[in-house]
């Protein structure tokens, strides 16, 4: 099966490396402009320079292309704790991050949102936290992991998946209430 | 205690338009970014939509940029969702909740509308 090219790409297959089709005259390849700039006008013939022009102030092109316009700067999200790493330059987007001692959690594809790394408090770390990943915690006896925090087992209630790992806390406190009972 | 009520899906036709409406209650609404996320039939939650504090700041999904608007009115405590040229993958259940602070997960959020885009 051969894979379906889109018409840009179509078009660009027909020239070298680093040149596009003319959209107005098929016969002719023109250089494509540089990162940190656009396509102002194409290429007037064969060997003649394509007229590029460089991106302006928030607004950027991160590698070579026939693009009409540049892209514009990402912003960092100040609502999702995000900072900004570096700033945009004509060649680079704006680059976002997270503070000292925080993790990115990704909702979607582009969408993070920074929060505190895990301290795991009464627990000791097993993994350390990472830019993509918080802290992964082992609790002491005692306590069992409920959102990534080492909680009491007397907040174990029967029904939810901490018996298994607060059991004998929970058989001990069942024994003291029967003992009182005799 | 925190309460989340949303309201105005229903059916409608591709193409067609509904507005979401979400009734804050039991916080400071003004002082909270507000989401909406989605969650279509045998699939996963996912982000539409948020708004910061004050209204000025948005993000959208690329599924739903260009056709949903999202909205506020602090005096009112309530949150919106205009969604315009609805398409038949856009049929969900759709929820407002509390953006969250903690950790990633909702703590806050509604019951949910149901809507349905079908001819």
């Known amino acids: 099966l051969v894979p379906h090219l889109g018409d840009r790409e179509k078009r660009d297959s027909v020239c070298p490396q680093g040149k596009y089709i003319h959209p107005q005259n098929n016969s002719i390849c023109c250089t494509k402009c540089h990162k940190g700039t656009y396509l102002y006008n194409d290429c007037p013939g064969p060997g003649q320079d394509t007229d590029c022009r460089e991106c302006e102030s928030g607004s950027f092109t991160a590698s070579e292309n026939h693009l009409r316009h540049c892209l514009s700067c990402s912003k960092c999200r100040k609502e999702m704790g995000q900072v900004e790493i570096s700033s945009c330059t004509v060649d680079r987007d704006t680059v976002c991050g997270c503070r000292k001692n925080q993790y990115r959690h990704y909702w979607s594809e582009n969408l993070f949102q920074c929060f505190n790394c895990s301290l795991c408090l009464n627990g000791t770390v097993h993994l350390s936290c990472q830019e993509k990943q918080n802290t992964v915690c082992t609790c002491h006896a005692g306590f069992f992991l409920r959102e990534n925090e080492c909680v009491s087992c007397s907040n174990c209630k029967k029904s939810l998946e901490c018996t298994k790992l607060c059991l004998p806390q929970i058989e001990n406190v069942k024994g003291t209430e029967d003992s009182g009972t005799t | 205690e925190v309460q989340l009520l949303e309201s105005g899906g229903g059916l409608v036709q591709p193409g067609g338009s509904l507005r979401l409406s979400c009734a804050a209650s039991g916080f400071t609404f003004a002082h909270e970014p507000m989401v909406w996320v989605r969650q279509a039939p045998g699939k996963g939650l996912e982000w539409v939509s948020h708004?910061?504090?004050?209204?000025?700041?948005?993000y959208y999904a690329d599924s739903v940029k260009g056709r949903f608007t999202i909205s506020r009115d602090n005096s009112k405590n309530t949150l919106y969702l205009q969604m315009n040229s609805l398409r038949a993958e856009d049929t969900a259940v759709y929820y407002c909740?509390?953006?969250?602070?903690?950790?990633?997960?909702?703590?806050?959020w509604g019951q949910g509308t149901l809507v349905t885009v079908s001819s």
């Open positions: 708004i910061d504090r004050v209204g000025q700041d948005t």
């Open positions: 909740a509390i953006l969250p602070k903690r950790g990633p997960r909702f703590d806050y």
